[in-house]
């Protein structure tokens, strides 16, 4: 009778993480009598995966009944596969011995490769806000995928970006890999509604890439433009002065009126109007009683936006018998009546 051979028909097996791997092994003879064992790796450091005779291997089940007489099928299934299970598995026949069984013959080995999906990409932007025309960096990270081959793309509002650098770690062989990419984005005033998207494509995703997003509203600061105007006379000896605060983002804004350099009133932007591009407009106005003044008055609208240094705009109010109409009427943007009589 021919000497027993251990046949592992599959040189390699590819399994998705979380699924079950079947490792096939058959013997060509029942002789010599003795158990089989499965190992991962070869040599003295090999790891025991299954022992027919003894031990507890909760993730391993045999395909056939190894206790059955004449059984020569020693295939096993390993459940809930993870990338850490990757490696070469050997089916080894032992010959019954005393006191210990003796290794008789090994199969050629089956390489188990594990396909693991990348984690959802996480996109993070700069810690501090930046203003239009500035370049900011965004990072994208995804972990735990295998095999190593992966594609990463950046988009801004659907337009692919080209200014980015990507690394996949580790460089050498590993059970799973991570990707890290940094993209540079130039901000514009219209970017409040913009999105930056990191897209990851991998063989495990079957053509349906994973995406991570960052809203530029978390990154951009659009400073306001100020315009101070004198409105027509509202009543005898009263002048309406408005400060138009336009195209700012985010909403956090504080406005202070100064008369001849002295603080007259401070208020916080509340009832703002939103522009189509996501920026805000706001208007504050002041009623000035000019009859109480002998000299001209310098009115200053000072705005502190999002914790930045204040910007201001001034208007010289001429004290004369009949104040002239100045500026334009933008009552549609009027947000409230802030009356101030000057005595």
């Amino acid at each position: 009778e021919e000497e027993l051979q251990v046949i592992q028909p599959d040189k390699s097996v590819l399994v998705a993480a979380g699924e079950t791997a079947t490792l096939r092994c058959t013997a060509t003879s029942l002789i010599p009598v003795g158990p089989i064992q499965w190992f991962r790796g070869a040599g003295p450091g090999r790891e025991l995966i299954y022992n027919q005779k003894e031990g507890h291997f909760p993730r391993v089940t045999t395909v056939s009944d190894l206790t059955k007489r004449n059984n020569m099928d020693f295939s096993i299934r390993i459940g809930n596969i993870t990338p850490a299970d990757a490696g070469t598995y050997y089916c080894v026949k032992f010959r019954k011995g005393s006191p210990d069984d003796v290794e008789f013959k090994s199969g050629a080995g089956t390489e188990l490769s594990v396909r693991a999906k990348p984690s959802a990409p996480v996109v993070s932007g700069p810690a501090a806000r930046a203003t239009p025309q500035h370049t900011v960096s965004f990072t994208c990270e995804s972990h735990g995928f295998s095999p190593r081959d992966i594609t990463l793309k950046w988009f801004k509002n659907g337009n692919e970006l080209s200014d980015f650098q990507t690394n996949v770690d580790p460089v050498g062989e590993s059970v799973s890999y991570s990707i890290h990419s940094t993209a540079k984005v130039v901000l514009t005033r219209e970017d409040v509604h913009s999105q930056v998207i990191c897209e990851v494509a991998h063989v495990t995703l079957q053509g349906d890439p994973l995406r991570g997003t960052a809203n530029l509203s978390e990154t951009i600061r659009v400073p306001p433009t100020l315009e101070v105007t004198q409105q027509p006379v509202r009543a005898e000896n009263q002048v309406n002065v408005t400060c138009q605060v336009r195209k700012f983002y985010p909403q956090r804004l504080q406005l202070t009126w100064l008369e001849n350099g002295n603080v007259s009133r401070t208020e916080t932007a509340s009832t703002v109007t939103e522009n189509k591009d996501g920026t805000y407009n706001w208007m504050s106005w002041l009623l000035v009683n000019v009859s109480a003044h002998r000299d001209d008055v310098k009115l200053t609208c000072q705005v502190e936006h999002d914790g930045q240094p204040a910007v201001s705009k001034s208007h010289d109010l001429k004290v004369s018998a009949h104040p002239k109409e100045q500026g334009s009427n933008t009552a549609a943007e009027n947000t409230g009546s802030n009356e101030r009589n000057i005595y």
């Epitope: 029942l30 002789i31 089940t61 056939s64 009944d65 206790t67 059955k68 007489r69 004449n70």
Partner: antibody, heavy 123, light 105 residues
Framework: VTLDESGGGLQTPGGALSLVCKGS????????MNWVRQAPGKGLEWVAG????????YYGAAVQGRATISRDNGQSTVRLQLNNLRAEDTATYYC?????????????????WGHGTEVIVSS | ALTQPASVSANPGETVEITCSGG?????YGWFQQKSPGSAPLTVI????KRPSDIPSRFSGSKSDSTGTLTITRVQAEDEAVYYC??????????FGAGTTLTVL
């Protein structure tokens, strides 16, 4: 080692029976179990067998498709259910234990027998 | 089914052999003693040559090629019984022989 069968008695043709065997005096979960029957005046006939962990079951040709063998290692019991009973199922049914070898159907490994339970299928 | 002789006989003190063939390739044989119809069989040999602890050493089993043999040395009157051999066929199904009646003269 003790194997106690129960569940026999008079059965009607076309009906179903459920035999239970309780094992004691040995590590039940380590041994394959078989059911063997003997019709009056006849020899021994293998009916069904089950592996020690219960994952694998085996059936004789005469009962294939009508029988189900199962085991509960926690309760140290093995059960044989036989449906669509026929007159030729009339026999004494023995529960057997395998020694430290073989599985269901490997009769060379039987090392212990129960006392048997008699089943009569008759209208 | 397995093939075994329908009957054998021996005088007390003699040695008797009962053969069994037809098991699956490389399979083993077990031997079961039944003293009367309806009484529970008793295993005298399993796994070719293993003897349960309560079985006298006069009973032994062996296998050569594909034939199993039950040997009873120094036969006694109480050994009179029907002896069945058991194994599995190549498909894994359990099979018994038709039984051999041992008569002690």
């Amino acid at each position: 080692v003790t194997l106690d069968e129960s569940g026999g008695g008079l059965q009607t043709p076309g009906g179903a029976l459920s035999l239970v065997c309780k094992g004691s005096g040995f590590t039940f979960s380590s041994h394959a179990m078989n059911w063997v029957r003997q019709a009056p005046g006849k020899g021994l006939e293998w009916v069904a067998g089950i592996s020690s962990d219960g994952r694998f079951t085996y059936y004789g040709a005469a009962v294939q498709g009508r029988a189900t063998i199962s085991r509960d290692n926690g309760q140290s019991t093995v059960r044989l259910q036989l449906n669509n009973l026929r007159a030729e199922d009339t026999a004494t049914y023995y529960c057997t234990k395998n020694g430290g070898c073989g599985s269901g159907g490997d009769l060379d490994c039987i090392d212990a027998w129960g006392h048997g339970t008699e089943v009569i299928v008759s209208s | 089914a397995l093939t075994q002789p329908a009957s054998v006989s021996a005088n007390p003190g003699e040695t008797v052999e009962i053969t069994c063939s037809g098991g699956g390739s490389n399979n083993a044989y077990g031997w079961f003693q039944q003293k009367s119809p309806g009484s529970a069989p008793l295993t005298v040999i399993y796994d070719n040559g293993k003897r349960p602890s309560d079985i006298p050493s006069r009973f032994s089993g062996s296998k050569s090629d594909s034939t199993g043999t039950l040997t009873i040395t120094r036969v006694q009157a109480e050994d009179e019984a029907v002896y069945y051999c058991g194994s599995a066929d190549n498909s894994g199904a359990g099979v018994f022989g038709a039984g051999t009646t041992l008569t002690v003269l």
